[in-house]
Amino acid sequence: QGKEVVLLDFAAAGGELGWLTHPYGKGWDLMQNIMNDMPIYMYSVCNVMSGDQDNWLRTNWVYRGEAERIFIELKFTVRDCNSFPGGASSCKETFNLYYAESDLDYGTNFQKRLFTKIDTIAPDEITVSSDFEARHVKLNVEERSVGPLTRKGFYLAFQDIGACVALLSVRVYYKKCPELLQGLAHFPETIAGSDAPSLATVAGTCVDHAVVPPGGEEPRMHCAVDGEWLVPIGQCLCQAGYEKVEDACQACSPGFFKFEASESPCLECPEHTLPSPEGATSCECEEGFFRAPQDPASMPCTRPPSAPHYLTAVGMGAKVELRWTPPQDSGGREDIVYSVTCEQCWPESGECGPCEASVRYSEPPHGLTRTSVTVSDLEPHMNYTFTVEARNGVSGLVTSRSFRTASVSINQTEPPKVRLEGRSTTSLSVSWSIPPPQQSRVWKYEVTYRKKGDSNSYNVRRTEGFSVTLDDLAPDTTYLVQVQALTQEGQGAGSKVHEFQTLSPEGSGN
């Protein structure tokens, strides 16, 4: 609500103001009456039976001070012209309100020409005979405003033109937007402007321990003509370590924290933190617990995970499938990833070294989220040790590692990959391949083939190369073909059995 600063209050003055009447001794008259058992003063006039009335009542000179626009509140009563005998033909039911600005008090020197009319004042309710007799004062309240005022002071004047009117209260005031705390900003008491459409912009200052948030607007309010604050812009927020309590920022209690300027309250220190002092912006982690750089301060402190719980390495020829289960202790985090590293050892020499360059993983071996991976292109008759390390967001903050290892010996080469290169009615041309690292260990390749459905007889061809043509075959017949590498240490893993069909005599020309 707007704050009113009173410049003139006739009702409160108890008849002591001594306003000027013109003409002197006629028209307006100061009188006392009793209302609600209290004496009240009023200026009244009731020359309704005589025409051409021009009775003036002028206030004392009122110092303007800092007011720009003044508000004039009038409380008055007007008698019904019909309540007089014959309706009092010259009777009126309105009066006029005037003002004049001046830099000095003219005293009893009254000049009508200096006054500017503000408005004609008409009652909402007139006092009829029955009200008058019963002493029911039909009080009207009218308010007008004038501005901008520029001189040191002013007068008000009331012109009677033949009404029966009593002025019970004349209150002149200006409006201020009151001192205000809003949005944790303090706005000073501000004089309301004089122009109705315009709003005075007032900058606010953040209360103690409050700040304008980064990228936020400075707090501003607009003081309207009627003394009301309008259109708040921007705000202040309690800084880190402080929370809003009513219109102030209060330090977080011990055991609580607030890590940034925000609207949120202080939060209780999360798990695995040490008790915080008053006004804390964060809570330190217990020993052995950590916070990753991207972790919010509200998150509990965490630690690195334990090692993967259970690790198996299953060899399949020249491939190994590694499987493991998540760590039993996640460290309180969900961002666990796994890294797989490989080491190979030569049985003859016992020499070992990393093998990342020579093996192939089914997916990149670092930052794995799944709990299995297949490693292929392993060399036969080699010992491999695989290490699976579990890591989370805080693993980088400690030197220790959480891992489990599994070893496996590769006794066979990987099965060759077989392709049909060509065929005729009596022959099949077949080729194969094995990973280059394993080729040096192969002495010869053994190709076994037989007619499909004939389990009693089969044929074997050996070759050092990577292809062979099988001749003397029956036309339009399906053959089962398998290729196996032979090494100094024995047989490698056989390929899968392929079904290849020779051409029929009719289709041989195609």
């Epitope: 008259d29 009188m31 006392q32 009456n33 009793i34 009023m42 009244s44 006039v45 009731c46 020359n47 309704v48 039976m49 009563t77 007007v78 008698r79 309540s83 007089f84 005998p85 006092t127 005979s129 029955s130 008058f132 007799e133 019963a134 002493r135 004062v137 029966c164 009117v165 009593a166």
Partner: antibody, heavy 128, light 107 residues
Framework: EVQLLESGGGLVQPGGSLRLSCAAS????????MAWVRQAPGKCLEWVSR????????HYADSVKGRFTISRDNSKNTLYLQMNSLRAEDTAVYYC?????????????????????WGQGTLVTVSS | DIQMTQSPSSLSASVGDRVTITCRAS??????LAWYQQKPGKAPKLLIY???NLHTGVPSRFSGSGSGTEFSLTISGLQPDDFATYYC?????????FGCGTKVEIK
């Protein structure tokens, strides 16, 4: 022309009763506040009682409160004063008086009334 | 009750004289005062109300003034018809008290 004519006065013994009447004419009786004012021989005027235009409110001087009753009959344009438990000090000429707010050229009514029209009076003598 | 004191209690004057009668209230009555004229054997007649307002039909040689506790009735240019007793009455309270009158006699 406004006329007020009192009647009902006379000689009465102390403790006795009397009813005064005031017949009104020449004006709208129901618009007027009416009152009784008395004047003891060689003494000041003394207000006795008043009644509003519609029959209320009524007021009494302390000296007659509880003994006198003012009333009116607007249909008969008549004002009454019932006087009981009369005393010697009630001996006086009793005037009927009227007030019409329409002739009171003031913006706010006074705390009480004055009297614009008066009757010729009727003498009440209380004596044993 | 409010006491009303008139002075003088009687005065002698000649036709054409200016006569002033005063009335004092025992406490402030603002301007709630009326003046009446009464001739022997007749009813009182209203002259002035609200201290200075002339009642309808009353000659303008009668005037009233004052406020608070001091009031006066002035007859400027006394006429033969004006020889009578004059009463003041306050109506600031329900007791509506009268003064005891000032008798204006022919000198």
């Amino acid at each position: 022309e406004v006329q007020l004519l009192e009647s009902g006065g006379g000689l009465v013994q102390p403790g006795g009763s009397l009813r005064l009447s005031c017949a009104a004419s020449g004006f709208t009786f129901s618009h007027y506040m009416m009152a009784w004012v008395r004047q003891a021989p060689g003494k000041c005027l003394e207000w006795v009682s008043r009644i509003g235009p519609s029959g209320g409110p009524t007021h009494y001087a302390d000296s007659v409160k509880g003994r006198f009753t003012i009333s009116r009959d607007n249909s008969k344009n008549t004002l009454y004063l019932q006087m009981n438990s009369l005393r010697a000090e009630d001996t006086a000429v009793y005037y009927c008086a009227g007030y019409d707010s329409g002739y009171d050229y003031v913006a706010v009514a006074g705390p009480a009334e004055y009297f614009q029209h008066w009757g010729q009076g009727t003498l009440v003598t209380v004596s044993s | 009750d409010i006491q009303m004191t008139q002075s003088p209690s009687s005065l002698s004057a000649s036709v054409g004289d200016r006569v002033t009668i005063t009335c004092r209230a025992s406490q402030s009555i603002s301007t709630w005062l009326a003046w009446y004229q009464q001739k022997p054997g007749k009813a009182p007649k209203l002259l002035i109300y609200k201290a200075s307002n002339l009642h309808t039909g009353v000659p303008s040689r009668f005037s009233g003034s004052g406020s608070g506790t001091e009031f006066s009735l002035t007859i400027s240019g006394l006429q033969p018809d004006d020889f009578a007793t004059y009463y003041c009455q306050q109506y600031n309270s329900y007791s509506r008290t009268f003064g005891c009158g000032t008798k204006v006699e022919i000198k």
